[in-house]
């Protein structure tokens, strides 16, 4: 029962994590204008992986997509790639794990097959989570570097009367969503891998026992059950109980509207 719960929980945690990775990838607030010197601004800039936006005091927001591919920084392209790989791996992992769930019966699928599928999806979730964490961390590092560079530039060349204030960017909400989501996917993957160990039928090594019958000397050695490594296993060992754990997979998150002056 604990194995089923672990597997189910791992699935749900990974599902939430992957939903978060998708949300973070689509979000526009990867970097937001630093408001340290001016906490309330008439023009507020923020940027995502796919477009940059400007919100005015008037309440209007204008977003413009990055319509160039070659003109974008290599780091941004790398972050995009990492996030997409994370989403793809996570989606495949979810698909595999659905069929691997112990509480779902599909034909005469063996526990050994389910164990392998659980392990596969677990590994996929771990890699997916790592991709998301790596992507977000690369972007964060890029922001930190640019922040200090623009801070240094702010205090140079101000001898004249006219000031040119350079817009500095800091961490946006998407980074935190990405980190948390990546972490959840990673945790979910680890849970799936743990569940896999419990799902795999144990190799029972019975010692050879000699039965001495009168007149004959017969040695009887029962064969041990061995878990198959392939998906299409033909071994017929079945668990006696059927796990009945149910998963709460209809978790909806509603975006909140933030209005700024």
């Amino acid at each position: 029962m604990a194995v089923t719960a672990c597997q189910g929980l791992g699935f749900v945690v990974s599902l939430i994590g992957i939903a978060g990775i998708i949300a973070a990838t689509c979000m526009d607030q990867w970097s937001t204008q630093d408001l340290y010197n001016n906490p309330v601004t008439a023009v507020f800039n923020y940027q995502g992986l796919w477009r940059s936006c400007v919100r005015e005091s008037s309440g209007f927001t204008e977003c413009r997509g990055y319509f160039t591919l070659l003109g974008l920084p290599a780091m941004l392209q790398a972050v995009r790639a990492l996030m997409i790989v994370g989403i793809v791996l996570g989606a495949i992992g979810l698909l595999v794990s659905i069929f691997a769930l112990k509480c779902i019966r599909i034909g005469s699928m063996e526990d050994s097959a389910k164990a392998n599928m659980t392990l596969t999806s677990g590994i996929m979730f771990i890699v997916s989570g790592l991709c998301a964490i790596a992507g977000v961390s690369v972007f964060a590092n890029m922001l930190v570097t640019n922040f200090w560079m623009s801070t240094a530039n702010m205090y140079t060349g101000m001898g004249g009367m006219v000031q040119t204030v350079q817009t500095r960017y800091t961490f946006g909400a998407a980074l935190f969503v990405g980190w948390v989501a990546g972490g959840l996917t990673l945790i979910g993957g680890v849970m799936m891998c743990i569940a896999c160990r419990g799902l795999a039928p144990e190799e029972t090594n019975y010692k050879a026992v000699s039965y001495h019958a009168s007149g004959h000397s017969v040695a009887y050695k029962p064969g041990g059950f061995k878990a198959s490594t392939g998906f299409g296993s033909n071994t017929k060992n079945k668990k006696i109980y059927d796990g009945g754990a149910r998963t709460e997979d209809e978790v909806q998150s509603y975006p909140s509207k933030h209005d700024y002056v």
Partner: antibody
Framework: EVQLQQSGAEVKKPGASVKVSCKAS????????MNWVKQAPGQGLEWIGL????????SYAQKFQGRVTMTRDTSISTAYMELSRLRSDDTAVYYC???????????WGQGTSVTVSS | DIVMTQSPDSLAVSLGERATINCKSS????????????LTWYQQKPGQPPKLLIY???TRESGVPDRFSGSGSGTDFTLTISSLQAEDVAVYYC?????????FGAGTKLELK
Amino acid sequence: EVQLQQSGAEVKKPGASVKVSCKASGYSFTGYTMNWVKQAPGQGLEWIGLINPYNGGTSYAQKFQGRVTMTRDTSISTAYMELSRLRSDDTAVYYCARMNYGNAMDYWGQGTSVTVSS
Amino acid sequence: DIVMTQSPDSLAVSLGERATINCKSSQSLLNSGNQKNYLTWYQQKPGQPPKLLIYWASTRESGVPDRFSGSGSGTDFTLTISSLQAEDVAVYYCQNDYSYPLTFGAGTKLELK
């Protein structure tokens, strides 16, 4: 047709308060930020502050901070500006103005004359 | 605060002639996010509220005659009336719409010569 109708002229004594209203019509009141601008006799324009009618968020010019309060009543599409501890240099015409693209004020009220005199 | 400096204080131009009003800001009004200059021009006639002419430094408000045009970027801006008409006699103000507090220039009084 977009219209901003302001309340009538006021005569106040120093130290008193005045509350000017601005009734909006012809557009979605909560969809546009409302600004207040002061114009002293024979002088230029001076920004007092703004209010976001959607959430009531405000931003005031430092000069008026602590003396000005901007509110709104979305049920009657009206914005208010209250100026307290009035002084003689508060004698001016006060305008409400709707903010549009580029933070530009595209529609203005007719103005409310406030005279502070003892 | 961003200081807006208008020049000249007053300007006398003949009918049909070109009128040019300058506005200089103490800080750049160019927003890097959308590459737009947050500068607005208003016209005010005696006893009337101001009227919006140009926003984003060069975008003409709908209904404004095309003889009015705005130009400039960063800190230096210009309002040009290509052929002055009698109804253009007014006071013209530039305004910083980029940073709080939103500040206006002192105004330029345009008169007929």
